[in-house]
């Protein structure tokens, strides 16, 4: 921002009323009113160019310094060409000297040259030649000098003529301030510019109404340079929640809009399924039946729990069930749907029911499922099972109602036994099997059926209560097809896969384990 000038002295604006002191009195500098650029103006002039050595002084009135540390002196003046004065060229000069003196009191008419310190020799960029002057055109020069630091209550300026033909049209003395400033939603007070050119005064800003320094952000600061310019902004303020930046201020969010945190972003329109917000809202309340999860941003629409899963099917495969379902028709407006599967078993004889989580096995953990199918195994035969699939999302926990679908299935067969070849010889095969422990109590006997591969006319059956059998009197180096089936009081259970096991050839030795 441009520096602000505070004027301490303005000769041109005073209309000849300042009454500056001339020394020697009545000689040298002279105040007169003249017309320049068709305007009557007062000016001090001197033109003793033919009179040899000159030492004519013009001293300003005493100027109160106030808060100024460095002053700037702007001079507007015109100098006539020494060649305009025939015979005057030898003693004629085209410069004058600028001086200042500090003091704590006004010395009045007591003028003492020795108290003055020279600031500079003032030389014109352009001189006024005779032809210009006679046509009433003078070349106006503008020079600026600065002095500081000043420490006394006031000061004088003085102009020393050493034999020039010069007119002083304007003397303006001012100091500079960095003007009051609003930047980055921070207010910086008007600040006096320092006196030392390299130094920058650090000035703390204050956040405007309804603005705050963001968490972890830097407090707003600016630097006031010697020329009254603000430099190097640091930090900023942001409009607090419920307010947005409008030009250099924070304005409350309009009704129907909200802003949930201090940020640079504008207020946002209330999202779907929210009630109209009042002015200055930090969030928008949800419509009845809609909710916002703790981790949901305020900008997200309010949502509700999903409807129940769609099309739940339970397909029994022996002592296993595959559950399949489709996602809810209404997701509640969310994408974070998960499923939970629970299981209940009922005994047909007694009609008694109870949870079965401990006795069954799921293909993946039954809670927090993201897929839409799961396999449940280790089911007991001749048992009724009811499976419940519940759909949940991020706001389901905010309501007591549940969204679920159930499917029931009756297990009529045991699960097929898992068969292993334990050993073999040229004439025998040792076979073992297993079924899930919950089903074992319901098995009366196991039936092992075997025959030569390729012989479809005859087969052999062996029954046993145990979990293994050795099949003897077999042909060497021959492949046999073997199947094991559980027998229960209610009938046959599911048969195992048909396995191909081969006896050893005669060259093979004894009873080798496989």
């Amino acid at each position: 921002a441009q520096g602000k000038e505070v004027v301490l002295l303005d000769f041109a604006a005073a209309g000849g009323e300042l009454g500056w002191l001339t020394h020697p009195y009545g000689k040298g500098w002279d105040l007169m009113q003249n017309i320049m650029n068709d305007m009557p103006i007062y000016m001090y002039s001197v033109c003793n160019v033919m009179s040899g050595d000159q030492d004519n002084w013009l001293r300003t009135n005493w100027v109160y310094r106030g808060e100024a540390e460095r002053i700037f002196i702007e001079l507007k003046f015109t100098v006539r060409d020494c060649n305009s004065f025939p015979g005057g060229a030898s003693s004629c000069k085209e410069t004058f000297n600028l001086y200042y003196a500090e003091s704590d009191l006004d010395y009045g008419t007591n003028f003492q040259k020795r108290l003055f310190t020279k600031i500079d020799t003032i030389a014109p960029d352009e001189i006024t030649v005779s032809s210009d002057f006679e046509a009433r055109h003078v070349k106006l020069n503008v020079e600026e000098r600065s002095v500081g630091p000043l420490t006394r209550k006031g000061f004088y300026l003085a102009f020393q003529d050493i034999g020039a033909c010069v007119a002083l049209l304007s003397v303006r003395v001012y100091y500079k301030k960095c003007p009051e400033l609003l930047q980055g939603l921070a207010h910086f007070p008007e600040t006096i510019a320092g006196s030392d050119a390299p130094s920058l005064a650090t000035v703390a800003g204050t956040c405007v109404d309804h603005a705050v320094v963001p968490p972890g952000g830097e407090e707003p600061r600016m630097h006031c340079a010697v020329d009254g310019e603000w430099l190097v902004p640091i930090g900023q303020c942001l409009c607090q929640a419920g307010y947005e930046k409008v030009e250099d201020a924070c304005q409350a969010c309009s009704p129907g809009f909200f802003k949930f945190e201090a940020s640079e972003s504008p207020c946002l329109e209330c999202p779907e399924h929210t009630l109209p917000s009042p002015e200055g809202a930090t969030s928008c309340e949800c419509e009845e039946g809609f909710f916002r999860a703790p981790q949901d941003p305020a900008s997200m629409p309010c949502t509700r729990p999903p409807s129940a899963p769609h099309y739940l099917t339970a397909v029994g495969m022996g002592a296993k069930v595959e559950l399949r379902w489709t996602p809810p028709q209404d997701s509640g407006g969310r994408e974070d749907i998960v499923y939970s599967v629970t299981c209940e078993q009922c005994w047909p004889e007694s009609g008694e029911c109870g949870p079965c989580e401990a006795s069954v096995r799921y293909s993946e953990p039954p809670h927090g499922l993201t897929r839409t199918s799961v396999t449940v195994s280790d089911l007991e035969p001749h048992m009724n099972y009811t499976f419940t699939v519940e759909a949940r999302n991020g706001v389901s926990g905010l309501v007591t109602s549940r969204s679920f679908r159930t499917a029931s299935v009756s297990i009529n067969q045991t699960e097929p036994p898992k068969v292993r070849l334990e050993g073999r010889s040229t004439t025998s095969l040792s076979v073992s099997w297993s079924i899930p422990p919950p089903q074992q109590s319901r098995v009366w006997k196991y039936e092992v059926t075997y025959r030569k591969k390729g012989d479809s006319n005859s087969y052999n059956v062996r029954r046993t209560e145990g979990f293994s059998v050795t099949l003897d009197d077999l042909a060497p180096d021959t492949t046999y097809l073997v199947q094991v089936q559980a027998l229960t009081q209610e009938g046959q259970g599911a048969g195992s896969k048909v396995h191909e096991f081969q006896t050893l050839s005669p060259e093979g030795s004894g009873n080798l384990a496989v």
Epitope: I35, C47, M50, T78, S130, E134
Partner: antibody
Framework: EVQLLESGGGLVQPGGSLRLSCAAS????????MYWVRQAPGKGLEWVSS????????YYADSVKGRFTISRDNSKNTLYLQMNSLRAEDTAVYYC???????????WGLGSDYWGQGTLVTVSS | DIQMTQSPSSVSASVGDRVTITCRAS??????LAWYQQKPGKAPKLLIY???SLQSGVPSRFSGSGSGTDFTLTISSLQPEDFATYYC?????????FGGGTKVEIK
Amino acid sequence: EVQLLESGGGLVQPGGSLRLSCAASGFTFSYYRMYWVRQAPGKGLEWVSSIYSSGGPTYYADSVKGRFTISRDNSKNTLYLQMNSLRAEDTAVYYCAKDMGTGFWSGWGLGSDYWGQGTLVTVSS
Amino acid sequence: DIQMTQSPSSVSASVGDRVTITCRASQGISSWLAWYQQKPGKAPKLLIYAASSLQSGVPSRFSGSGSGTDFTLTISSLQPEDFATYYCQQANSFPLTFGGGTKVEIK
């Protein structure tokens, strides 16, 4: 003390010539514009001619243009008006006048601060 | 040429009276106007320059005002030595021109 002293006036027949002089003292003559102003008997003031400090530009009233010539000799501090082809209507008291202004502004042309006592020119047959 | 018109051409007044003389230029002359006083048989005397600046040595009862085309010379309290003829003169451009004069007479 500033003084301007005109001379050279008198009676002259129509068509005749006169040369007026104005001797200046008490100021730096070479700095200032100078003027000739006349006043016919019982009439008002009429500007006749001007010359700049350097002797450069000269200006004349339409009524005398081509007949009168203004000049100056800064070394002698003297202003002149050469009047030719005089007419009866040129009868007047002729004043030389100095441009006002001190120091720097000498010759700026604000007005005339010093006047001579005047010399009478009578054109009559 | 710029014509200067003075009014009134004469005015009768008594000692102590306030007298106002006006001068009108045929075109704008900014503040390039001078006022002179002339007594019979004497050379004119400069009173005011630059429309409103009092010439050194002139009594402060004389004042000038105006700019552009309309100008005024005011004598705030007429003194016996002020009975004379007053002329305005434009110094804006050549040819320099005077007003016709205003004669201030004793009533």
